[in-house]
């Protein structure tokens, strides 16, 4: 069941989710100059059976000046050789998340993919907040949220979550103080996606490294 | 108690706009998201989209993708769905419901028709 | 898109009867949710989550399944039931009801 509303915005926090629910959806979005080709699907879908869960349908962005060009969302395995190596970095996150049943992992990146992402959560989803960089965590609880519901209607619980104005971010769950990145900015910020559902994900491709940088942007 | 009102109705030329407008009252504007659904005479419901008054974020059933415009004005309390570019096809009831689930709250209903 | 058949489309009844509505969808489903609309007037909320009847609603309906099929029963039907009745899933995008099922006087 769709989560008919926002996980909450806590001042100077931004969110992501370590794993996503089977029936969690991601809008098929193109950068500016392309668009979702027109047989495409409008969303991926997070499916699955007993043992297994994945993305179902694959998120393709054609020009919108070239009428047959089409950008396939996920690589072919002979191209994922090629790709490897560039792709290792912005995809960092992959690589500590835990496989849950029922859960999908962070979808890949697909060519000229919008620069934000939105997520349509599911029941039963829990999104973890940080506080951003130069802001400091205090904790009175778990700073998560899940999304319930109750009498048909769905709403987010209150994550136990401050942050003040220090210099030292705080961390996910599970993770390890960052190292210092090579353009300064530590691992968390650079290589880990925050996710969301109607807030808006702006990306930025760092100069000096071919990783994605999400922060969230409030509306 | 939660109200939803719409609009009145409204009789369109083929190829004109209209916007209907849902002025929401008794609830938190912003706390819930508004949907709108159409009902074509003599036929079934079909979901349209849905604005988040909050962020003005607004996801649409492709079908009504290049048909319809929500938006919401925050000082108001009130929802608006445009439509353009009417044809006769587009002759239908439109209903505003009040989301965050299930939809609890439904307005009247405001009759659009499309003739020449 | 989810595909939501439900059956009969109509379905003529007495006062006093026992009537079941069948929703099937497409794809799996969490839940299924059903409205009531009377002629003239906006739906409403009458079962939701399956099995939940909303505020003010009489005990004498009820609602079953899971998967892909749903059922909305009515145990003896009353004059002020004779509506029609949608089911509902809001389980993916695009949301998607039924066709409708009209619940005539015999």
């Known amino acids: 069941e769709l989560c008919d509303d926002d996980p909450p915005k806590i001042t100077h926090a931004t969110f992501k989710a370590v794993a996503y629910k089977e029936g969690t959806m991601l809008n098929c979005e193109c950068k500016r100059g392309f668009r979702r080709i027109k047989s495409g699907s409008p969303y991926m879908l997070c499916t699955g059976n007993s043992s297994h869960s994945s993305w179902d349908n694959q998120c393709q962005c054609t020009s919108s000046a070239a009428r047959n060009t089409t950008k396939q969302v996920t690589p072919q395995p002979e191209e994922q050789k090629e790709r490897k190596t560039t792709e290792m970095q912005s995809q960092m996150q992959l690589a500590d998340q835990v496989s849950l049943p029922g859960h999908c992992r962070e979808p890949p990146p697909w060519e000229n993919e919008a620069t934000e992402r939105i997520y349509h959560f599911v029941v039963g989803q829990t999104v973890y907040y940080q506080c951003v960089q130069g802001y400091r965590a205090l904790h009175r609880g778990p700073a998560e949220s899940v999304c319930k519901m109750t009498h048909g209607k769905t709403r987010w619980t209150q994550p136990q979550l401050i942050c003040t104005g220090e210099t030292e971010p705080s961390q996910f769950p599970g993770e390890e103080e960052p190292q210092a990145s090579p353009d300064g900015l530590p691992e968390s910020e650079t290589s880990r996606l925050v996710t969301t559902t109607d807030f808006r994900i702006q990306t930025e491709v760092a100069a000096t490294m071919e990783t994605f940088i999400f922060t969230t942007e409030y509306q | 108690q939660v109200q939803l009102v719409q609009s009145g109705a409204e009789v369109k030329k083929p190829g004109s706009s209209v916007k209907v407008s849902c002025k929401a009252s008794?609830?938190?504007?912003?706390?819930?998201?508004m949907h709108w659904v159409r009902q074509a005479p003599g036929q079934g419901l079909e979901w349209m989209g849905y604005i988040n008054p909050s962020s003005g974020y607004t996801e649409y059933n492709q079908k009504f993708k290049d048909k319809a415009t929500i938006t919401a004005d925050e000082s108001t309390n009130t929802a608006y769905m445009e439509l353009s570019s009417l044809r006769s096809e587009d002759t239908a009831v439109y209903y505003c419901a009040r989301g965050g689930g299930v939809f609890d709250y439904w307005g009247q209903g405001t009759l659009v028709t499309v003739s020449s | 898109d989810i595909q939501m058949t439900q059956s009969p489309s109509t379905l003529s009844a007495s006062v006093g009867d026992r009537v079941t509505i069948t929703c099937s969808a497409s794809?799996?489903?969490?839940?299924m949710h059903w409205y009531q609309q009377k002629p003239g007037k906006a739906p409403k909320l009458l079962i939701y989550t399956t099995s939940d009847l909303a505020s003010g609603v009489p005990a004498r309906f009820s609602g079953s399944g899971s998967g892909t099929e749903f059922t909305l029963t009515i145990s003896s039907l009353q004059p002020d039931d004779f509506a029609t009745y949608y089911c509902h899933q809001r389980s993916t995008y695009p949301l998607t009801f039924g066709q409708g099922t009209k619940v005539e006087v015999k």
């Open positions: 008794g609830y938190t504007f912003t706390s819930y998201r």
């Open positions: 794809s799996k489903i969490s839940y």
